[in-house]
């Protein structure tokens, strides 16, 4: 059975702020059967950014349709951003579960926020 | 305007239980991991337990097997059972907010644990 | 466990001078440090993290350096607000996320 792979292809992405910022993960399988999140940072203290089956995310949004039978793209875009947006970002694969159990992460890919152009 | 509210500290005897909740507001709890932090009197700052986003729970060695951290996002509450209390865990515990740096961003006013026969 | 110990144990200035106290890691942390005041009776408040960034709303006159396992904390002209004790914590290595002793710093 191939192991499963979560990739993102980005090491760094650099948005202006205001504009919105596109996350790109891919998964390499469909199987196991279980949902992917983006989080903000490393270690325990890492920050929620996206969770499909719940929660409140107003400015992220997945770019393809996550319910569409077959789908292996999570990536997700972040509106009107902000310095503070700044960060490592890790979409992370998990297990369908009670509770879910975390699989497999991708590499990170780091957004840094330009200036906006006057 | 994000409030952390600490509350069920008071005056126990050894060996008794006790927990304490901390009501949190002005942020997206599900969002974050929260923390425990106790100071006893006179003394500095020590790291009780983390609870993180997904619920991974961590423990300071000196509580490891007594105290439980859990949280309901549904009422934006976090949560510490504590179970055989000891004269050593007197202190005032603070809930604080937990940033994606592993920092502690906004802290409650604390509640005080004393642990007394 | 990353050990850190914090020096001097009280420091005595006088309003507008300038303050300067260290906080030592066994074990390099990186950048990963943070500073947090606290006053008698409140809670800890959150100044600086990543060694040198300020956290939200902290006043200019507060400064981070260092990195490894050696770090100061700078307060460049002291306000009478900022009479107080200051910790450092690693965000590096965890659990357990450790703190230092403290520096209280009194007026003069």
């Known amino acids: 059975e191939e192991e499963l792979q979560v990739i993102q292809p980005e090491k760094s992405v650099s948005v202006a702020a205001g504009d919105s910022a596109t996350l790109n993960c891919t998964v390499s399988s469909l199987i196991p059967v279980g949902p992917i999140q983006w989080f903000r940072g490393a270690g325990p203290g890492r920050e929620l950014i996206y969770n499909l089956k719940e929660g409140h995310f107003p400015r992220v949004t997945a770019v393809s349709d996550p319910t569409k039978r077959n789908n292996m793209d999570f990536s997700i875009r972040i509106s009107n951003i902000t310095p503070a947006d700044a960060g490592t970002y890790y979409c992370v694969k998990f297990r369908k579960g009670s509770p879910d159990v975390e699989l497999k992460s991708g590499a990170g890919t780091e957004l840094s926020v330009r200036a906006k152009p006057s | 305007d994000v409030q952390l509210v600490e509350s069920g500290g008071g005056l126990v005897r050894p060996g008794e239980s006790l927990r304490l909740s901390c009501a949190a507001s002005?942020?997206?709890?599900?969002?974050?991991?929260v923390t425990w932090v106790r100071q006893a009197p006179g003394e500095g700052l020590e790291w009780v337990s983390l609870?993180?986003?997904?619920?991974?729970?961590y423990y300071a060695d000196s509580v490891k097997g007594r105290f439980t951290i859990s949280r309901d996002n549904s009422k934006s509450t976090l949560y510490l059972q504590m179970n055989s209390l000891r004269a050593e865990d007197t202190a005032v515990y603070y809930c604080?907010?937990?940033?994606?740096?592993?920092?502690?961003?906004?802290w409650g006013l604390g509640t005080l644990v004393t642990v007394s026969s | 466990e990353i050990v850190l110990t914090q020096s001097p144990g009280t420091l005595s200035v006088s309003p507008g001078e300038r303050a300067t106290f260290s906080c030592r890691a066994s074990q390099t942390v990186g950048s990963k440090l943070a500073w947090y005041q606290q006053k008698p009776g409140q809670a800890p408040r959150l100044l600086i993290y990543d060694a040198n960034t300020r956290a939200t709303g902290i006043p200019a006159r507060f400064s981070g350096s260092g990195s490894g396992t050696e770090f100061t904390l700078t307060i460049s002209s002291l306000q009478s607000e900022d009479f107080a004790v200051y910790y450092c914590?690693?965000?590096?290595?965890?659990?357990?996320?450790?703190f230092g002793g403290g520096t209280k710093v009194e007026i003069k």
């Open positions: 609870i993180s986003v997904t619920g991974t729970t």
């Open positions: 604080a907010k937990v940033t994606w740096k592993n920092v502690f961003d906004y």
């Open positions: 914590q690693q965000h590096t290595d965890w659990p357990p996320y450790t």
């Open positions: 002005g942020f997206t709890f599900t969002n974050y991991a």
